[in-house]
């Protein structure tokens, strides 16, 4: 608060304004300010056993202001209150107290928790999670082909993070074992998925080609007799996908 404090300067009678300092309109030797200049707030300050009137540009901490027609007056909030709307309603408590519905409390009531940042009692917030997303495709080392047993995962999102006293969040991802109909990897599915593939130095005239993992169940190389037309390949892919879903089991 930028306070413009008017105090007695020399001995004088009450209601005599000459010699009043700062924002005082009238003052007395014993009581300090008796009234203030326009727009300033009048407050009583306790000094020892007596109260001294002061004029301020706004009410100090622990007081609230009322603009009456003839005087702007500061009134004390309750003892445990730092900022208040009026005598009944505190809006900020003194250190060590928590604000709840306009009152300052040592501890928050049942069902509420203390927010040590705002120093208010707030509702306990429990964790909320979404529904599970669908299971991922069955994979092994990042591939969806060339194996029999793999894993599939599913995830869900945290919609509401819990507050300090709220229920903790349940797991947000799950993994389970799955089995698939053995499926030969197509050309585009070969390569460095999961681990680095072993490479052999090519002989003269041989092209550099990734050698399938030793655990791969079938060679991905095709011989002419095994080639299918595009129509049949598409059909096969759809069937494989259906098999993967229908055959996968939880272990």
């Amino acid at each position: 608060q930028n306070a413009s404090r008017g105090r007695r300067q020399r001995r004088m009678h009450p209601n005599v304004s000459q010699g009043c300092q700062g924002g005082c309109a009238t003052c007395s030797d014993y009581n300090g300010c008796l009234s203030c200049k326009p727009r300033l707030f009048f407050a009583l300050e306790r000094i020892g056993m007596k109260q001294i009137g002061v004029c301020l540009s706004s009410c100090p901490s622990g007081y609230y202001g009322t603009r009456y027609p003839d005087i702007n007056k500061c009134t004390k909030c309750k003892a445990d209150c730092d900022t208040c709307f009026n005598k009944n309603f505190c809006t900020k408590c003194k250190s060590g107290f928590y604000l709840h519905l306009g009152k300052c409390l040592d501890n928050c009531p049942e069902g509420l928790e203390a927010n040590n940042h705002t120093m208010e009692c707030v509702s306990i917030v429990h964790c909320e999670v979404s529904e599970w997303n669908p299971w991922s495709p069955c994979t092994k080392k990042g591939k969806t082909c060339g194996f029999k047993r793999g894993t599939e995962t599913r995830v869900r999102e945290i919609i509401q993070h819990p507050s300090a006293k709220g229920n903790l969040c349940p797991p947000t991802n799950e993994t389970r074992k799955c089995t698939v109909q053995r499926k030969k990897c197509q050309k585009g599915e070969r390569g460095k998925k999961g681990r680095e593939r072993k490479r052999k130095k090519p002989n003269k005239g041989e092209s550099k080609e990734a050698i399938p993992d030793s655990k791969s169940l079938e060679s991905s190389k095709e011989i002419p007799e095994q080639r299918e037309n595009k129509q049949q390949q598409k059909k096969r892919k759809v069937q494989d996908k259906q098999k993967s879903v229908s055959v996968s089991t939880v272990h």
């Epitope: 009456y68 003839d70 709307f85 009026n86 005598k87 309603f89 809006t91």
Partner: antibody
Framework: EVQLVESGGGVVQPGRSLRLSCAAS????????MAWVRQAPGKGLEWVAT????????YFGDSVRGRFTVSRDNSKNTLYLQMNSLRAEDTAVYYC?????????WGQGTMVTVSS | DIQMTQSPSSLSASVGDRVTITCLVS??????FVWYQQKPGKAPKLLIY???RLQDGVPSRFSGSGSGTDFTLTISSLQPEDFATYYC?????????FGQGTKLEIK
């Protein structure tokens, strides 16, 4: 429990006087500025008057200034509204209320009808 | 005197609706602002003080917002007991002034 109970309402002729009382309990009456707020039938709320906690100053709405006076007896926890030179437009329910910037506690109201 | 312009003057809504009432003030009053609820034949009841703070016992579906000259009362999901008249009031300076009121009726 806070209670404010108004009394003294009734039917009165224009130009006559009426005195309303309000008995307070359940809070420290002498700590509060007290006010009268009125509501004409089917209309909104209108502040009438406020007297400060110690009775030393009082303030009035434009429509009643010079005709109404407000007083209090802190030893009896009672607020009064003296209404003189009553007019038809003063017809309303009069509520006694604790006034501390907001009107925190209200009585149930007393009806004043000014009619010839 | 500070003028208060409350709108709408009346409003029809259904149980479960979200309802908003506004109050415009003729000068900056910071957050020195109050909302009241009044039911027929009863005294007004203080709902919200300091523009946004709920009075003890007021359900959390009520909320207040605003500062300066524009203020809003929101009821997030109307309940049967919320059908009443609502008034705003500035508590910034004398004389205390009220809005004209908003009558909330069942559709």
């Amino acid at each position: 429990e806070v209670q404010l109970v108004e009394s003294g309402g009734g039917v009165v002729q224009p130009g006559r006087s009426l005195r309303l009382s309000c008995a307070a309990s359940g809070f420290t009456f002498s700590d509060y500025d007290m006010a009268w707020v009125r509501q004409a039938p089917g209309k909104g709320l209108e502040w009438v008057a406020t007297i400060i906690y110690d009775g030393s100053r009082a303030y009035f709405g434009d429509s009643v200034r010079g005709r109404f006076t407000v007083s209090r007896d802190n030893s009896k926890n009672t607020l009064y509204l003296q209404m003189n030179s009553l007019r038809a437009e003063d017809t309303a329910v009069y509520y006694c209320t604790a006034h501390d910037r907001s009107f925190d506690y209200w009585g149930q109201g007393t009806m004043v009808t000014v009619s010839s | 005197d500070i003028q208060m312009t409350q709108s709408p003057s009346s409003l029809s809504a259904s149980v479960g609706d979200r309802v908003t009432i506004t109050c415009l003030v003729s000068e900056d009053i910071s957050n020195d602002f109050v909302w009241y609820q009044q039911k027929p034949g009863k005294a007004p009841k203080l709902l919200i003080y300091a523009a946004s703070r709920l009075q003890d016992g007021v359900p959390s579906r009520f909320s207040g917002s605003g500062s300066g000259t524009d203020f809003t009362l929101t009821i997030s999901s109307l309940q049967p007991e919320d059908f009443a008249t609502y008034y705003c009031q500035q508590s910034y300076k004398y004389p205390p002034t009220f809005g004209q009121g908003t009558k909330l009726e069942i559709k």
